[in-house]
């Protein structure tokens, strides 16, 4: 539910039940992918370390009128401790390359259940 | 379809308790968190307290802290606000709210909300 | 302990445009949410992230926020539209909802 910004942290590590909510969105969108997703757009690709969920979700917020990944986007935020806007690049460290936002979606899915996989859920 | 569905209010002296529930029912309850949120007769919405889904943190507004409790029952899907030395300004709907995903539930907006359980303290 | 204000009423005729402002501390820093409430019925999300609407919420209904005000406004307003509107953000590990507007279609 719950909208809003601020610094305050309920806990640090994302349980398995809450990244399993975003492995499963993410895993709905590649299979019911049938046009190119959001239209082709690009969306810099991030490195999938430290700091991932806020660089995602700072990627892929400047994606907009989309539908297919707005769910993916509100999900990221419940794993970023910080507000998040389109142009807010301070958790992408490396801005070099662009990809399709399908191959963004497909490189953090199979990240993502490799760390679920690991019991890595921080 | 996402449900929620609050039991539990009636008519209760001040200083007396009350314990409201919440079934929860369409989602994966373990993973977000919950509020519960009140509204008195004819006055705004005002936060009461929440329950994260990662970690069990509670949160409470500082009008409510240290007289209600906020808890969880996941394997039964159900939300709990125990309420104790009710004031009649306690007095309103009471509503159960599905909160947000992840650790920082609270970026997320509060989508869900139940039909609201009426709570009245008078004497 | 942190305020969310906004006007108590704002009257609009049908069709025109009803601005809706909530103003708090730095509120451009936190994501902002705005509800409609009718009589006798739950709140409804109809803005999320400042300027997000939920799936099913009109376009007519848009959100912004910057520095200590976010806005919401309803463009080409309905009789439908008429109800009571909060915002809401999160500070210091508590939910805040603003004093709420009464939107009055005449």
């Known amino acids: 539910l719950t909208c809003l910004g601020g610094f305050a942290s309920p806990g640090p590590v994302p349980p398995s039940t809450a990244l399993r909510e975003l492995i499963e969105e993410l895993v709905n969108i590649t299979q019911n992918q049938k046009a190119p997703l959001c239209n082709g757009s690009m969306v810099w690709s991030i490195n999938l370390t430290a700091g991932m969920y806020c660089a995602a979700l700072e990627s892929l917020i400047n994606v907009s009128g989309c539908s297919a990944i707005e769910k993916t986007q509100r999900m990221l935020s419940g794993f970023c401790p910080h507000k998040v806007s389109a142009g807010q690049f301070s958790s992408l460290h490396v801005r070099d390359t662009k990809i399709e936002v399908a191959q963004f979606v497909k490189d953090l899915l199979l990240h993502l259940k490799k760390l679920f996989r690991e019991g890595q859920f921080n | 379809e996402v449900q929620l569905l609050e039991s539990g209010g009636g008519l209760v002296q001040p200083g007396g308790s009350l314990r409201l529930s919440c079934a929860a029912s369409?989602?994966?309850?373990?993973?977000?968190?919950m509020s519960w949120v009140r509204q008195a007769p004819g006055k705004g919405l005002e936060w009461v307290s929440a329950?994260?889904?990662?970690?069990?943190?509670?949160y409470y507004a500082d009008s409510v802290k240290g007289r209600f409790t906020i808890s969880r029952d996941n394997s039964k899907n159900t939300l709990y606000l125990q309420m104790n030395s009710l004031r009649a300004e306690d007095t309103a709907v009471y509503y159960c709210?599905?909160?947000?995903?992840?650790?920082?539930?609270?970026?997320?907006?509060?989508?869900?909300w139940g039909q609201g359980t009426t709570v009245t303290v008078s004497s | 302990s942190y305020e969310l204000t906004q006007p108590p009423s704002v009257s609009v005729s049908p069709g025109q445009t009803a601005s809706i402002t909530c103003s708090g501390d730095?509120?451009?820093?936190?994501?902002a949410c705005w509800f409609q409430q009718k009589p006798g019925q739950s709140p409804v999300l109809v803005i999320y992230?400042?300027?997000k609407r939920p799936s099913g919420i009109p376009e007519r209904f848009s959100g912004s926020n910057s520095g200590d005000t976010a806005t919401l406004t309803i463009s080409g307003t309905q009789a439908m539209d008429e109800a009571d509107y909060y915002c809401?953000?999160?500070?210091?590990?508590?939910?805040?909802f603003g004093t709420g507007t009464k939107v009055t279609v005449l």
């Open positions: 329950f994260s889904g990662s970690g069990g943190s509670t």
């Open positions: 992230h400042d300027s």
């Open positions: 809401q953000a999160w500070d210091s590990s508590t939910y805040v």
């Open positions: 730095k509120l451009g820093d936190k994501y």
């Open positions: 709210v599905q909160d947000g995903l992840g650790p920082y539930f609270y970026n997320y907006g509060m989508d869900v």
């Open positions: 369409g989602f994966t309850f373990s993973s977000y968190a």
